[in-house]
């Protein structure tokens, strides 16, 4: 079953390569287990950047050696992606799955265009 997911259209990463955005989903029921995946769509590729499963009210547990962190509050997930560089600029899509209890719901946002600008190197001082 389909579900609406909202996320900001554009986010500018900080000079330290950190980008944060909120992914909000319209839950049709009372889900207790939710899976959130961030997909990057750019350069003719689709990459699962990070994924987390959480029980409502608990911390997000990210899979693998994740470059993401996040917290949840109700039907909102606050996502932070770290270690970004200019070449990581692209469309970052939030995918939300309500895993339990049935029925299964899937929602995919329109994506957040994250712009990353590498900081200028500091000039040498004599």
């Amino acid at each position: 079953k389909a579900m609406h997911v909202a996320q900001p259209a554009v986010v500018l990463a900080s000079s330290r390569g950190i980008a944060s955005f909120v992914c909000e989903y319209a839950s049709p029921g009372k889900a207790t287990e939710v899976r959130v995946t961030v997909l990057r769509q750019a350069d003719s590729q689709v990459t699962e950047v990070c994924a987390a499963t959480y029980m409502m009210g608990n911390e997000l547990t990210f899979l693998d050696d994740s470059i993401c962190t996040g917290t949840s509050s109700g039907n909102q997930v606050n996502l932070t992606i770290q270690g970004l560089r200019a070449m990581d600029t692209g469309l970052y899509i939030c995918k939300v799955e309500l895993m339990y209890p049935p029925p299964y719901y899937l929602g995919i946002g329109n994506g957040t265009q994250i712009y990353v600008i590498d900081p200028e190197p500091c000039p040498d001082s004599d």
Partner: nanobody, 125 residues
Framework: EVQLVESGGDLVQPGGSLRLSCAAS????????VGWFRQAPGKDREFVTA????????AYADSVKDRFTISRDNAKKMAYLQMNSLKPEDTAVYYC??????????????????WGQGTQVTVSS
Amino acid sequence: EVQLVESGGDLVQPGGSLRLSCAASGRTFSNYTVGWFRQAPGKDREFVTAISRSGSLKAYADSVKDRFTISRDNAKKMAYLQMNSLKPEDTAVYYCAGAPVPWGARPSLFTYDSWGQGTQVTVSS
């Protein structure tokens, strides 16, 4: 670095399926992100797909998305590429590669320091 050997390449008809395998030896396989690349005659080597160290995260080139599936079995030190609905343009030498780095937003640009010798895939009727 890890040593990689590909197998499973063959001649297959358009629309057919093939499963490539990549066997690893040497260093700890689970410390490596694994990617598959391909090179067609007269063309540059291109990224096909990659999988994170635990196997939970994946990346695909748009040209193979929904047709190819990457997987791995760390206990067996193996990586696999399941190729379905093959097209003549999939004809190439397919290489398995390993990168001793954690996952990130651009796995196609990781520094892959271990490469197999390649296996030929030909899609033709």
